[in-house]
Amino acid sequence: ASNFDCCLGYTDRILHPKFIVGFTRQLANEGCDINAIIFHTKKKLSVCANPKQTWVKYIVRLLSKKVKNM
């Protein structure tokens, strides 16, 4: 769901935090069409997720906490 570093859509799977090592935010007003969270997985994949979905917010919060505590 990503093209030229821009997400064009969202994954239809829910991912577990154990699978995710980090994320980046994509903003629609910064050259891409949609807002997205790009999760970086342990399999070196980039997964585009909907920032409005609860599970996405949960993982972002978890990862942000981890960074704060480092």
């Epitope: 577990h16 154990k18 342990k42 409005k52 979905q53 609860t54």
Partner: antibody, heavy 120, light 107 residues
């Protein structure tokens, strides 16, 4: 205490639809996912899908897309699953179960299950 | 989809024995694995979450271990009350697939 109440049984005719309910109590309904799981007689557990009551987001097992439709009524803390175009393969016990981020996405409370029998 | 393979499918053991049930995933699931216990005529219950954590209210005779693609559930000092079917479940990504189950009986 947390409770998920489901009707005990439904008898339906082949080709018809059934809508079963799952009434939640004892917790904040919108803070947890609701999963639905199928168990056919003498068989294992099959994950049908989940709904997030906070935003009505649904995620289905591809196998059940077009067969199951998950909805919620947050005002009554009730989740629903509708099964359409029923055949004998749909005869099973269907459980609603609470999905909890806090226990590694585990299903920590289960309803008693609704037994669906498809028969003419 | 991630496939989960449980073994054995059935198991008979004596009271006081220790038994082990294994669960294999078709790919690395990074410890995102849960175990459930289903007693005859009852709804399933969460037993172990995150591969190793004991769920509230479950006996400490149950323990989970494993990583990557291979996981196991150990029941020590078997009680008659442990008669049930045990299921593993992948929660790494949807669809959340279950193993085929292991039916435990007492000799």
């Amino acid at each position: 205490q947390v409770q998920l109440q489901q009707p005990g049984a439904e008898l339906v005719k082949p080709g018809a639809s059934v809508k079963m309910s799952c009434k939640a109590s004892g917790y904040t309904f919108t803070s947890y996912w609701m999963h639905w799981v199928k168990q056919r007689p003498g068989q294992g557990l099959e994950w049908i899908g989940l709904i997030d009551p906070s935003d009505k987001y649904t995620n289905y097992n591809q196998k059940f897309k077009g067969k199951a439709t998950l909805t919620v009524d947050t005002s009554s803390s009730t989740a629903y699953m509708q099964l359409s175009s029923l055949t004998s393969e749909d005869s099973a016990v269907y459980y609603c179960t609470r999905g909890n981020y806090g226990v590694d996405y585990g299903m920590d409370y289960w309803g008693q299950g609704t037994s669906v029998t498809v028969s003419s | 989809d991630i496939q989960m393979t449980q073994s054995p499918a059935s198991l008979s053991a004596s009271v006081g024995e220790t038994v082990t049930i294994t669960c294999g995933a078709s790919e690395n699931i990074y410890g995102a694995l849960n175990w459930y216990q289903r007693k005859q005529g009852k709804s399933p219950q969460l037993l172990i979450y995150g591969a190793t954590n004991l769920a509230d209210g479950m006996s400490s005779r149950f323990s989970g271990s494993g990583s990557g693609r291979q996981y196991s559930l150990k029941i020590s000092s078997l009680h008659p009350d442990d008669v049930a079917t045990y299921y593993c479940q992948n929660v790494l990504s949807t669809p959340y697939t279950f193993g085929g189950g292991t039916k435990l009986e007492i000799k």
